[in-house]
């Protein structure tokens, strides 16, 4: 009689993660008597995947009933495949012996490759806010995909970015891979409503790429512009001075009025007006009793925005003239050294 052959018809198979893999194996003879075992890998470090008679293999089922007298089909099905299951599987026939069974013949092996989807890309921006005209870095990470080939693109408001660097790890063979990309983005004053998008395309996604986004509102700080103006007031001895705080983001803002360098009032911004570009405006006013001052008054509007060093704008109020005559003199006074230019 012809010597037993172990036939593994599939040289390779590819399975999506989470699905089942069927590994085919048949033998051509019932002799010699002895069990079939399945291994992943070859040599002394090989991993036992299935033993016909003993061992705990909850993910493995046999395709046919191995207890049937003339059974020659030793195919197995492995459930819930993960990238860690990738490798070459060997169907091995053993001959009963003493003290241990003796390996008799092995199949040629079936290489199992696992297609695994990348995780949803996670985009993260800088730890601290940055102002317009500055360049900031965004990172995008996605993990657990296989095979290694993957495409990553960056977009800002739908426009593809070109200034980025991408790495796929590890460089050599692995059960699964990770991608890491860093993109550089130049901020503009209009970016409060902008989004940065990382798009990942992979064979497992069937043309429907995964996207991760970051809102530039989390990254940008738009410093305010200040304008101090004097308004005429009907009351004989009172002048209304306003401080217009314009085009700032985020909302966190504290304003202090100083009269000749002395703190007059401090207030936190509330009831803000939102601009179309996502920035905010706010106005504060100060009612100055002119009769309480003999000399000219230097009024300063000092603004601390989002924890940054204060910026200020001053206005010189002449007390010698009649308040109503001053109404036309609305030009702001000279800016202090720390003031933001208008």
């Amino acid at each position: 009689e012809e010597e037993l052959q172990v036939i593994q018809p599939d040289k390779s198979i590819s399975v999506a993660a989470g699905e089942s893999a069927t590994l085919h194996c048949t033998v051509t003879s019932l002799i010699p008597v002895g069990p079939i075992q399945w291994f992943r890998g070859a040599g002394p470090g090989r991993e036992l995947i299935y033993n016909q008679k003993e061992g705990h293999f909850p993910r493995v089922t046999t395709v046919s009933d191995l207890t049937k007298r003339n059974n020659m089909d030793f195919s197995i099905r492995i459930s819930n495949i993960t990238p860690a299951d990738a490798g070459t599987y060997y169907c091995v026939k053993f001959r009963k012996g003493s003290p241990d069974h003796v390996e008799f013949k092995s199949g040629a092996g079936t290489e199992l490759s696992v297609r695994a989807k990348p995780s949803a890309p996670v985009v993260s921006g800088p730890a601290a806010r940055a102002t317009p005209q500055h360049t900031v870095s965004f990172t995008c990470e996605s993990h657990g995909f296989s095979p290694r080939d993957i495409t990553l693109k960056w977009f800002k408001n739908g426009n593809e970015l070109s200034d980025f660097q991408t790495n796929v790890d590890p460089a050599g063979d692995s059960v699964s891979y990770s991608i890491h990309s860093t993109a550089k983005v130049v901020l503009t004053r209009e970016d409060v409503h902008s989004q940065v998008i990382c798009e990942v395309a992979h064979v497992t996604l069937q043309g429907d790429p995964l996207r991760g986004t970051a809102n530039l509102s989390e990254t940008i700080r738009v410093p305010p512009t200040l304008e101090v103006t004097q308004q005429p007031v009907r009351a004989e001895n009172q002048v209304n001075v306003t401080c217009q705080v314009r085009k700032f983001y985020p909302q966190r803002l504290q304003l202090t009025w100083l009269e000749n360098g002395n703190v007059s009032r401090t207030e936190t911004a509330s009831t803000l007006t939102e601009n179309k570009d996502g920035t905010y405006n706010w106005m504060s006013w100060l009612l100055v009793n002119v009769s309480a001052h003999r000399d000219d008054v230097k009024l300063t509007c000092q603004v601390e925005h989002d924890g940054q060093p204060a910026v200020s704008k001053s206005h010189d109020l002449k007390v010698s003239a009649h308040p109503k005559e001053q109404g036309s003199n609305t030009a702001p006074g000279p800016a202090l050294a720390s003031a933001a230019p208008l």
Epitope: V33, G45, E47, L48, K53, E54, G55, H56, P99
Partner: antibody
């Protein structure tokens, strides 16, 4: 549901023999080896041996060679462990275990006493 | 034959404490063939960990197993009262198959 039902308590005199049984249900006994394990009171576990019910082929730990004999009857889905020339050292709980290792019988308590 | 030595033989741990039980083999055991059992008084042993690191059905995730060659371990990340039991390692890499002497784990 997989079950291994073992025979009840045995009290036997020294020098005698005893045959313990383990009846399988919920699976085909020929599909797995059947193992036997000994546990003395408050002691560890000792592997006695295993049998392939399909053809009766068996392996024994050296310590139990000549002491234990394993057999199986596939028609009744029952595995047997015969222990001979009993001494007080054989007093123990004996378990049968399916080859997949997750199913154990409830154990048979054997007491050897005069 | 392969002798499996477990240490410590007896130990006690407080709730929440990390516990590591070791199993040392007199010669190399393939990781596929190293199993752990849990046994409580009056009950049959229960398969607890198979193929060195895989938890059997129903085993809490605070348990883990690791090792290779001649050195294996079972770890409980945070000891619970219900973990008090005896634990046995077992090899079926080569005949005769053997059990370790066991570790009796008590709760403080």
């Amino acid at each position: 549901e997989v079950q291994l039902q073992q025979s009840g308590v045995e009290v036997v005199q020294p020098g005698a023999s005893v045959k313990l049984s383990c009846t399988a249900s919920g699976f085909n006994i020929e599909a797995y080896y059947m193992h036997w394990v000994k546990q003395r009171t408050e002691q560890g576990l000792e592997w006695i041996g295993r049998i392939d019910p399909e053809d009766g082929e068996s392996k024994y730990a050296p310590k139990f060679q000549g002491k234990a004999t394993m057999t199986a009857d596939t028609s009744s889905s029952t595995a047997y462990l015969q222990l001979s020339s009993l001494t007080s050292d054989d007093t123990a709980v004996y378990y049968c275990v399916r080859g997949s290792y997750e199913y154990w019988g409830q154990g048979t308590t054997l007491t050897v006493s005069s | 034959q392969i002798v499996l030595t477990q240490s410590p033989a007896i130990m006690s741990a407080s709730p929440g404490e990390k516990v590591t039980l070791t199993c040392s083999a007199s010669s190399s055991v393939s990781s596929s063939y190293l199993y752990w059992y849990q046994q409580k008084p009056g009950s049959s042993p229960k398969l607890w960990i198979y193929s060195t690191s895989n938890l059997a059905s129903g085993v809490p995730p605070r348990f883990s197993g690791s090792g290779s060659g001649t050195s294996y371990s079972l770890t409980i990340s945070s000891m619970q009262a219900e973990d008090a039991a005896s634990y046995f390692c077992y090899q079926w890499s080569s005949y005769p198959y053997t059990f370790g002497g066991g570790t009796k784990l008590e709760i403080k």
